[in-house]
Interface confidence: low
Amino acid sequence: GSERTCCPVNWVEHERSCYWFSRSGKAWADADNYCRLEDAHLVVVTSWEEQKFVQHHIGPVNTWMGLHDQNGPWKWVDGTDYETGFKNWRPEQPDDWYGHGLGGGEDCAHFTDDGRWNDDVCQRPYRWVCETELDKASQEPPLL
């Protein structure tokens, strides 16, 4: 496929990635699907610099990122290693809280109003951020 050399319209370029910031809310799975349909993924935060950039654009609003533990351990949607990677959890988070009484725990991560991360019920309709990398093939290569 052809390589993407500039960001799509309405996306913001930063450090060789393109970011799109929603202004409405979706459940985590719906947000994840939205990004995939844009040939992107929910944002994967790999550094304090990237954290500050995203935080600046989303403001003090709960916003989904591409981090979840719905199938066991915490995983980034693009395969970035969670254990060795950047983290910015709120104190005492993630806590997989069951006390909300909504069924199950809390399996999806979001930016809170101060930018730090919290795990929450994946069905909540938060805003979200999509990310795609420049120089990435914009289409999957054909299967050989």
Epitope: V61, Y98, H100, G104, D113, Q123, R124, R127
Partner: antibody, heavy 114, light 107 residues
Framework: QVQLQQWGAGLLKPSETLSLTCAVY????????WTWIRQPPGKGLEWIGE???????NYNPSLKSRVTISVDTSKNQFSLKLSSVTAADTAVYYC????????WGQGTLVAVSA | DIQMTQSPSSLSASVGDRVTITCRAS??????LGWYQQKPGKAPKRLIY???SLQRGVPSRFSGSGSGTEFTLTISSLQPEDFATYYC?????????FGGGTKVEIK
């Protein structure tokens, strides 16, 4: 102890806009979604929609075109507006905490009559 | 939308009876279901969350079970204060939907 106290106009004419407010006392306001539910006289319960402290909303598609839910975090309050009401909107309207609905307001009877 | 079919719509029972109310979801909702009791002129009160967890302060004669599409509320020994209408609520998918209610009356 969490308490929800609600108020608003109880008698409306057709085509007017219903307006209710719910104040939250105790507990965390920012940690939850805040919900509106209604119950026509002698009938069952219907979920209207919800909002959180940052303004994210979710509405019942059956009412979405007429519903606005807003929030005032400085007062720990959230509000419901339902436009172009008809007799079919006559109901007791409840506010509740989150979509687990573990705490409820006392209810407000809203009657729509010409 | 997920339809919640509650049965029976009404029942007559005596104090001390064991009462069972069922909610059936039109599609799987895991255990994302609550049970509520409503008395005339009052707001509903949650009895059970996550299909089977007892709300704090609710008597242990109330219990919930089920997962997926079939859910049950059981009152092991009906007391005079239990005569009321009971509703289930699913919160797995938007819009949230209630069952039609079960009115428990004195026989």
């Amino acid at each position: 102890q969490v308490q929800l106290q609600q108020w608003g106009a109880g008698l409306l004419k057709p085509s007017e806009t219903l307006s209710l407010t719910c104040a939250v006392y105790g507990g965390s306001f920012s940690g939850y979604f805040w919900t509106w539910i209604r119950q026509p006289p002698g009938k069952g319960l219907e979920w209207i929609g919800e909002i959180n402290h940052s303004g994210s909303t979710n509405y019942n598609p059956s009412l979405k075109s007429r519903v606005t839910i807003s929030v005032d975090t400085s007062k720990n309050q959230f509000s419901l507006k339902l436009s172009s009401v008809t007799a079919a909107d006559t109901a007791v309207y409840y506010c509740a905490r989150d979509y687990g609905a573990d705490y409820w307001g006392q209810g407000t009877l809203v009657a729509v009559s010409a | 939308d997920i339809q919640m079919t509650q049965s029976p719509s009404s029942l007559s029972a005596s104090v001390g009876d064991r009462v069972t109310i069922t909610c059936r979801a039109s599609q799987g909702i895991r255990n994302d279901l609550g049970w509520y009791q409503q008395k005339p002129g009052k707001a509903p009160k949650r009895l059970i969350y996550s299909a089977s967890s007892l709300q704090r302060g609710v008597p242990s004669r109330f219990s919930g079970s089920g997962s997926g599409t079939e859910f049950t509320l059981t009152i092991s020994s009906l007391q005079p204060e239990d005569f009321a209408t009971y509703y289930c609520l699913q919160h797995k998918r938007y819009p949230l939907t209630f069952g039609g209610g079960t009115k428990v009356e004195i026989k």
